[in-house]
């Protein structure tokens, strides 16, 4: 007799990433009796909701059930009709909505309602939207990346069965950019970890971890640049603001009330005799950097060592992957290649930057040019960020990775938030029978 | 859970200044304004004036301007109502409370009295 | 300013019966479709205890007589079946705008 095909036995999760300028959702699915062996979790689908990032809606809440739709539906098609009302569906909010909340938890509150009353008409199993800390943004993302590297198995392969493997089982760091706040997170090596805030204490199949994190708000790349447009027009001598970090060329007209819109600049508000001004570039990548480490407050320090703002940040120990914007950005201006130094990435940089705005659209003529302006200002703000702020060094530069994907699996938070949730992570090691790998002692 | 706790009372002559405590425990302390709002003797609730603690920005009300500075120490988690050139009428119940424009969680008060 | 006014200054009512105050804003204050109108309870030697946010939403912990409605400029707080331990000050507050205003506060005392 033949053989008939067994109906395939997976489970599927659905996170949603709320950022401060994009919501994207992201389809896992895992054979359902594997769930707790590390690895098997895997992405099949990412999906970019068109639009700005929900805490852009508070005057328009009525337009985010349509905002939300494509995304929704083409989950809908994605995972197959018998399994969507037991698939959870997780939505996570980040610095957007944490920055929004710090203006009016009202406000925050109607949009997550209006997201949860959207959310709440799709067949899937809705477990809620909310926003997550910037403590657990860096914890997810540092799960994350170390479950697609396999670094929680406990079986040691003598292949490599991922990029940047290495045999042993010391797991890397997390490097996170978003658009308003970025985080860092490592396993110190040693090292008390002197801020009780910056302290993570896991256990995961079987094995401790003491992990340091922090999340700097106001810190992603877009929130930086406000910042530093804050920072910068305090002392321009009239409405004309000649800014290095972008191209020869450029101009754009800039709101004085939306610069002061977000609490990110609220340390550089002043009356000002003039309700716009023009940014004019100038292209100077020196002056840039410059100016970004203005943002950076490192004369202040009340442990052993600080990031900046008086922040603890241990030794940096081991491998790191940088990924969200860290990767976009630094892919776009083709450095994320392994073997480029530090030293030739801002060799790079300062030539990207001194190129006419005229030059660069001819050459980029498919990017949207609110995004192409800000590549230089990009790309010098992570050079800043992770050399001054971080105190990455030319030496140590080499083991940073700029990862976009993990075995198809995009690197972020959203993994490691639904395997917790879906208590898909064990505190022990599984033990498996000889017979079966779906059975548990 | 969230708690502000706030230092002991006061007691100033005419003319000085006096700083009032607000420590901050149970969440992100740089996530969350902090707000300060003081109420004399048988008297409204009066809004001095709120901190970012994140940056340090600070806003007040025009009644309070230029006498009133709000600072934060981030790595205590502690916010900081320094009021100068004190007089009589400033003796009040200064309290610290968090939100951004809802204060959910107050601290328990610091009653300041100014007399000579 | 936004200017909050509040009425009655004091309110006797019998136990289990209901308390009705009023606040009316001098503007409104309303923005984004949110009423930023909040009711706040105070006891002596105590701080303020938020019962309602939003002009109508309950605040942790605070029981369901506690009500409040309005939009615009005028709100109103009821308490359904006043109970003994209701008896303190409540106070209006608008935040939609700086300076952050407070009405003069109401006395709810047992008749």
């Known amino acids: 007799t033949q053989n008939k095909a067994l109906p395939e036995n997976v489970k599927y999760g659905i996170v949603l990433d709320a950022g401060s300028s994009h919501t994207s959702l992201y389809i896992y699915k895992w054979p359902a009796e594997k769930e707790n062996d590390t690895g098997v979790v895997h992405q099949v689908e990412e999906c970019r909701v068109k639009g700005p990032g929900i805490s852009k809606f508070v005057q328009k809440v009525n337009e985010i059930g349509i905002y939300l739709t494509d995304c929704m539906e083409r989950a809908r098609e994605v995972i197959p009709r018998s399994q969507h009302q037991e698939t959870p569906v997780y939505l996570g909010a980040t610095a957007g909505m944490r920055l929004l909340r710090m203006e009016s938890e009202e406000l925050a509150d109607r949009v997550l309602d209006v997201v949860e009353r959207s959310l709440s008409n799709y067949p899937f199993d809705f477990q809620g939207a909310r926003i997550i800390t910037g403590q657990e943004e860096g914890a997810y993302g540092w799960i994350t990346i170390n479950y697609l590297l396999g670094k929680f198995s406990q079986k040691t392969r003598w292949f490599s069965i991922v990029p940047y493997e290495t045999n042993n089982q010391e797991t890397f760091g997390a490097l996170d950019l978003g658009g308003a706040s970025t985080q860092v997170t490592f396993v110190p090596q040693n090292q008390t970890i002197e801020s009780p805030d910056n302290a993570l204490q896991f256990r995961l199949y079987g094995k401790d971890y003491n992990v340091y994190t922090h999340s700097f708000l106001c810190y992603g790349k877009d929130q930086a640049l406000w910042q530093k447009l804050a920072k910068d027009i305090q002392v321009a001598s009239n409405e004309i603001l000649r800014d290095p970090c972008f191209h020869p060329g450029y101009k754009k007209v800039v709101n004085v009330s939306d610069l002061y819109k977000t609490p990110c600049t609220k340390r550089f508000e002043m009356t000002l005799p003039f309700q716009q001004f023009e940014i004019q570039g100038i292209g100077n990548y020196q002056q840039c950097h410059q100016s970004i480490l203005e943002l950076f407050n490192t004369s202040y320090c009340p442990y052993s060592q600080c990031a900046f703002n008086g922040i603890f940040l241990p030794p940096l120990q081991g491998d790191f992957g940088a990924f969200s914007a860290f990767y976009f950005v630094m892919k776009f201006l083709n450095l994320t290649s392994e073997k480029v130094s530090q030293e030739k990435v801002t060799e790079m940089m300062k030539k990207f930057c001194a190129q006419p705005w005229e030059e660069i659209k001819t050459s980029y003529a498919g990017v949207k040019e609110k995004y192409l302006s800000e590549y230089c200002f990009s790309g010098t703000y992570i050079l800043s960020l992770l050399l001054q702020g971080y105190h990455f060094t030319a030496d140590s530069w080499e083991h940073i990775h700029f990862i976009g994907k993990i075995q198809g699996s995009d690197a972020g938070w959203t993994l490691g938030y639904m395997l917790n949730l879906t208590n898909m992570i064990p505190a022990e090691q599984p033990l498996s029978t000889p017979l079966s790998h779906s059975t548990y002692v | 859970q969230v708690q502000l706790v706030q230092s002991g009372a006061e007691v100033k002559k005419p003319g000085a200044s006096v700083k009032v405590s607000c420590k901050a425990s149970?969440?992100?302390?740089?996530?969350?304004?902090m707000h300060w709002v003081r109420q004399a003797p048988g008297q409204r609730l009066e809004w001095i004036g709120y901190?970012?603690?994140?940056?340090?920005?600070?806003t007040f009300s025009q009644k309070f301007q230029g006498r009133a500075t709000i600072t934060v120490d981030t790595s205590a988690s502690t916010a900081y109502m320094e009021l100068s050139s004190l007089r009589s009428e400033d003796t009040a119940v200064y309290y610290c409370?968090?939100?951004?424009?809802?204060?959910?969680?107050w601290g328990q008060g610091t009653l300041v009295t100014v007399s000579s | 300013d936004i200017v909050m006014t509040q009425s009655p200054d004091s309110l006797a009512v019998s136990l289990g019966e209901r308390a009705t105050i009023n606040c009316r804003a001098s503007?409104?204050?309303?923005?984004?479709?949110?009423?930023?109108m909040y009711w706040y309870q105070q006891k002596p030697g105590q701080p303020p205890k938020l019962l309602i946010y939003g002009a109508s939403n309950q605040g942790s912990g605070v029981p369901d007589r506690f009500s409040g409605s309005g939009s615009g400029t005028d709100f109103t707080l009821t308490i359904s079946s006043l109970q003994a331990e209701d008896v303190a000050v409540y106070y209006c507050?608008?935040?939609?705008?700086?300076?952050?205003?407070f009405g003069g506060g109401t006395k709810v005392e047992i008749k």
């Open positions: 503007e409104s204050v309303d923005n984004f479709g949110v009423s930023f």
């Open positions: 901190i970012v603690p994140l940056n340090g920005g600070s």
């Open positions: 149970g969440y992100t302390f740089t996530d969350y304004n």
């Open positions: 507050q608008q935040t939609k705008e700086v300076p952050y205003t």
């Open positions: 409370a968090r939100g951004g424009t809802r204060f959910a969680y």
